[in-house]
């Protein structure tokens, strides 16, 4: 789980191990703050929990452009 | 492809406690998400508890909250599902699920199964 | 946590009729944004583990006859046996994965009129 030591700066310590499928994800952001020890992904699911991820993991890159054509296509 | 192995049958007497194993081969355990799921003789099934990825950690059915503590070993690629304070009403057949390597929530791979017969 | 109701408790048709189970969720399990329905449906034979048949409430798992066929929205689900055949007669049941506590359904005994 994401780490808010010195809000509003949230950090990322661990990875989740787990590939979680793209239809359980709500959306997510980046971290890339230098007061962070790492570079991470947190996503956000459809019931609102959050979850640190890799960002050089393939399946978080594809996860991310999923979710970012999501956003972009206008629902029917 | 997974594959899931459980151990063999056992007879407990009231007040013990069981240890059911789920042995996984094609993937490794901390790659997936191990759950338990129980069935009474001819009742339904009954979600017990299991790991889930957004939690991050393991969480149980709240009717066997204190009861039941469920453990992986990943050098050994088991995971493990262990009872205590065993009642007559726990006899049923213990599985062990996991849903594929992406997480969704619904259970792909089942392991055959192992009875649990509770009697004094 | 979410309850899931089947009906009937049990059925009996008759070979090459259509078979109809019902699933009602206590609280929606659809997810607007991506219009996916976290439900799924499973068969059970005697002395078996359940078989996944269909996820996402109407995608058939690959392998499974197009004779079995879900649909639904929402907090109402149907599986469809399209012609009974005898290797059909099981006990299904329907699970939402929308939140924690997973659950199922109570099952629904399929057999042969």
């Known amino acids: 789980q994401p780490d808010a030591i010195n809000a509003p700066v949230t950090c990322c310590y661990n990875f989740t191990n787990r590939k979680i499928s793209v239809q359980r994800l709500a959306s997510y952001r980046r971290i890339t703050s230098s007061k962070c020890p790492k570079e991470a992904v947190i996503f956000k699911t459809i019931v609102a929990k959050e979850i640190c991820a890799d960002p050089k993991q393939k399946w978080v890159q594809d996860s991310m452009d999923h979710l970012d054509k999501q956003t972009q296509t206008p629902k029917t | 492809q997974v594959q899931l192995v459980q151990s063999g049958a056992e007879v407990k007497k009231p007040g013990a406690s069981v240890k059911v194993s789920c042995k996984v081969s094609?993937?490794?355990?901390?790659?997936?998400?191990m759950h338990w799921v129980r069935q009474a003789p001819g009742k339904g099934l009954e979600w017990m508890g299991g790991?889930?990825?957004?939690?991050?950690?393991?969480i149980y059915a709240q009717k066997f909250q204190g009861r039941v503590t469920m453990t992986e070993d990943t050098s050994t690629d088991t995971a493990y599902m262990e009872l205590s304070s065993l009642r007559s009403e726990d006899t049923a057949v213990y599985y062990c699920?996991?849903?594929?390597?992406?997480?969704?929530?619904?259970?792909?791979?089942w392991g055959q199964g192992t009875l649990v017969t509770v009697s004094s | 946590d979410i309850v899931m109701t089947q009906s009937p408790d049990s059925l009996a048709v008759s070979l090459g009729e259509r078979a109809t189970i019902n699933c009602k969720s206590s609280?929606?399990?659809?997810?607007?944004?991506?219009?996916?329905?976290?439900l799924a449906w499973y068969q059970q034979k005697p002395g078996q583990p359940p078989k996944l048949l269909i996820y996402?409430?109407?995608t058939r798992e690959s392998g499974v006859p197009d004779r079995f066929s879900g649909s639904g929205s929402g907090t109402d689900f149907t599986l469809t046996i399209s012609s009974l055949q005898a290797e059909d007669v099981a006990v299904y049941y329907c699970?939402?994965?929308?939140?924690?506590?997973?659950?199922f359904g109570q099952g629904t005994k399929v057999e042969i009129k």
């Open positions: 699920a996991t849903d594929r390597e992406f997480w969704s929530g619904y259970f792909y791979h």
């Open positions: 094609g993937y490794t355990l901390t790659e997936l998400s």
């Open positions: 790991f889930d990825p957004e939690d991050g950690e393991t």
């Open positions: 699970q939402q994965y929308y939140n924690s506590p997973w659950t």
């Open positions: 996402w409430a109407s």
């Open positions: 609280q929606s399990v659809l997810y607007s944004s991506n219009n996916e329905n976290f």
